[in-house]
């Protein structure tokens, strides 16, 4: 209207979706009577009456605002509840007297979007793609107005870059009036991006100011060709026979190429392909010295059929050969001397040790063991250990048995056995000597003989206890080419008062056995009856 002053800018009221907007009519008393006001909403330049105030009393007009409007602040403020994005428009109040004046309010509506949902290309990105590929998507749901998206790589914002980086954003309006933003990051990636961290950030505004939400960080599968191939051996360090050894082919490409591992044949000077497991790993278990040699890996790109060869790697499986001792079966007279010599081969320097088998006592450090003035007790086992000091656990041993010529030697000379009449008695007798003796008994019964070792024999006799046997006792005699020797077993009747309560006498069996280690006196095992204290 000519001569009318230009409309002032509307007052700005900012609210979040779902909250209540307070629309305060800013007409001064001179511009109009606030007890008589009409409220309008303006949409696409069309004004619609939504509320009347008469004599300070409010009345909603039928329509979309009917249920959501009420008067506050003695009629000066119109409250709009449950604000929606569709409420973002101009509202105006118009006073009726003395002159029709209006006051405009611009309602701005805000809603924070949900946390951004980032998705990575599930198939990955090849570095040699001809065009930028879809790297990831970022979706921000239910925001208002449309949030802004910024993509980051390793903490730095990504900018559009011709033929390198392209950000494609689109939005959809939900039935609620809220916006869902989808942003697609397209890029040409390079090998170095395999470890890059990408994320997206949504920037949005609320009445309280500017805010942002970040997605989780993601890495993108990046595919790049193999440039280098190499072999790795596990375990690292010195290998020995018996170890589990893995020879693994590695490449710097993704996905890994197809591998084959071959070993050089020293005689033919040709490489022979080895059988690897499904992962392309050659497993040597147990490793043997024959596995030593030169290995190399060939990597094949199945798309291009181009192959790459690794640097060859020498594998040394350290070993100790079988140990040889000479003489292998020594026999000596008492009082004589003996020299035992130990030999073995190895891929490393060897150390030798001689040990007594029965005691594990170290007798000599070195391959030669000299024994002088041999006694009968010197008979038995001698062990040579050949070891590689630099490789723990790499050793081999050989046992040699020394036999000392001599007549039989009894485990005991005499012994007392407690018995009951008419019981079946199990008696045992042990003797050693070289040549190995045989044992005989002076009474009838069932005898059985068993070798303890080449120089030692144990004989057992089952016999019925009779009065005559009680009278005579039992003798066992051991004999060989060099003489004979006897042990005597005295049988004594036990009377029941000498038994302890837990003694087991129900079997009617008494066992008399000499321990192989006890050379002077006898010990009995199993259900041997206790000796009465009164007998001493």
């Amino acid at each position: 209207v000519p001569g009318e002053a230009e409309q002032p800018a509307p007052e700005l009221v900012e609210v979040e979706v779902g909250s209540t907007a307070l629309l305060k009519c800013g007409l001064s008393q001179s511009q109009g009577n606030l007890s008589h006001v009409d409220w309008f909403s303006v949409h696409k330049e069309k004004r619609t009456l939504i509320f009347r105030v008469r004599q300070g009393q409010g009345q909603s007009e039928p329509g979309e605002y009917e249920q959501r409007l009420s008067l506050q602040d003695r009629g000066a403020t119109l409250a709009l509840t449950q604000v929606t994005p569709q409420d973002e428009r101009i509202f105006l109040c118009q006073g009726k007297r003395p002159r029709s004046q209006e006051y405009r309010i611009q309602l701005r509506v805000y809603k924070a979007p949900e946390e951004p949902n980032i998705q990575v290309n599930p198939l990955g990105i090849p570095v040699n793609s001809k065009e930028p590929e879809e790297v990831a998507t970022c979706v921000g749901r239910n925001g208002y107005p449309i949030p802004q998206v910024i993509w980051y790589k390793n903490g730095r914002p990504l900018k559009e870059e011709k033929n390198r980086v392209h950000i494609q954003s689109s939005q959809t309006v939900e039935s609620s009036g809220l916006y869902t933003l989808q942003s697609i990051l397209k890029a040409q990636l390079v090998k170095e991006d395999k470890d890059a961290q990408f994320y997206c950030e949504l920037n949005y505004r609320l009445p309280s100011g500017n805010h942002m939400k970040e997605s989780r960080e993601v890495t993108v599968p990046v595919f790049y060709p193999t440039e280098k191939v190499w072999l790795e051996v596990e375990p690292v360090g010195m290998l020995k026979e018996g170890d589990r050894v893995e020879i693994r082919c590695l490449a710097d490409g993704n996905p890994p190429p197809h591998f084959s591992i071959s070993k050089g044949n020293p005689s033919t000077r040709e490489a022979e392909e080895e059988t690897t497991n499904d992962n392309g790993v050659l497993v040597l278990e147990p490793a043997r010295k024959e596995h030593s040699g030169r290995y190399e890996c060939q990597a094949w790109n199945l798309d291009t059929m181009i192959s790459l060869l690794s640097e060859p790697q020498e594998l040394l499986v350290n070993y100790v050969s079988d140990v040889r001792v000479s003489p292998a079966a020594p026999e000596r007279q008492e009082g004589s001397s003996l020299t035992l010599t130990c030999e073995a081969e190895s891929s490393q320097d060897l150390e030798f040790q001689w040990l007594r088998e029965e005691t594990d006592q170290v007798l000599e450090r070195g391959p030669v063991l000299q024994l002088h003035d041999l006694k009968r007790e010197a008979g038995g086992g001698y062990r040579c250990v050949a070891s590689v000091p630099s490789i723990p656990g790499l050793n081999r041993t050989q046992l040699v048995k020394l036999a000392i010529f001599g007549p039989p030697w009894m485990a005991f000379k005499e012994r007392k056995v407690w018995v009951k009449e008419n019981m079946v008695l199990n008696l045992s007798c042990e003797a050693s000597g070289h040549p190995r003796p045989t044992i005989s008994w002076n009474v009838n019964g069932t005898a059985s003989e068993g070798d303890q070792d080449p120089q030692r024999v144990l004989s057992t006799l089952n016999v019925l206890v009779t009065p005559e046997l009680l009278e005579t006792g039992v003798e066992c005699t051991a004999s060989n080419d060099l003489g004979k020797n006897t042990s005597i077993l005295f049988l004594e009747l036990v009377n029941l008062t000498t038994l302890t309560p837990d003694s087991n006498t129900t079997t009617g069996l008494s066992t008399s056995t000499a321990s192989p280690h006890t050379r002077a006196n006898s010990t009995s095992t199993e259900r041997k009856l206790p000796e009465p204290e009164s007998r001493g």
Epitope: Q119, N121, P122, L123, E133, E134
Partner: antibody, heavy 116, light 106 residues
Amino acid sequence: QVTLKESGPVLVKPTETLTLTCTVSGFSLTSNGVSWVRQPPGKALEWIAAISSGGSTYYNSAFKSRLTISRNTSKSQVVLTMTNMDPVDTATYYCARHRPFYFDYWGQGTLVTVSS
Amino acid sequence: DIQMTQSPSSLSASVGDRVTITCKGSQNIYKSLAWFQLKPGKVPKLLIYDANSLQTGIPSRFSGSGSGTDFTLTISSLQPEDVATYYCQQYYSGYTFGGGTKVEIK
């Protein structure tokens, strides 16, 4: 309106090569990737191969050595070839559009029977 | 490879019933999950993407929920036209599908 249509032989002999064509309309192959998916009778869906909007190709490693996927952008066609066919490859073969990572539109599928 | 385990393999429900199908991933796939409806001789239909987003044109009785490894497709009120086989699919690393759930009307 987005549509995808698979075409190819209904019957293939064992050891032969299968060639399937997916003809698309309503979008450009330079804007969306396309995947091939199959479903053997009475079994679940199985992804076979894909070609991205940028032209990169991807294969299910279970079939890798037997597959080739390619496209003709001017004809709006994606072609899948599968060599050395076997009766276990009998299935309904579908092509599907990527948006950008899930499949939003599918073809109705074509049943391929492998039999001598 | 990520395995997707769907249950049940089949179900029978009455019209108007609430039907729930579950899908479990062998590892965390965040929200990279879609649900499809397959009917014999028909074009497979995308119902849900990003675990809980309803595809345009799909009735609101279909809804999806879940994140990480456990996901659910719900049909709030089963209709005769919902008889089909339903598949979940992960697109976090490669593409793999669940074994499918056949839905029938009692």
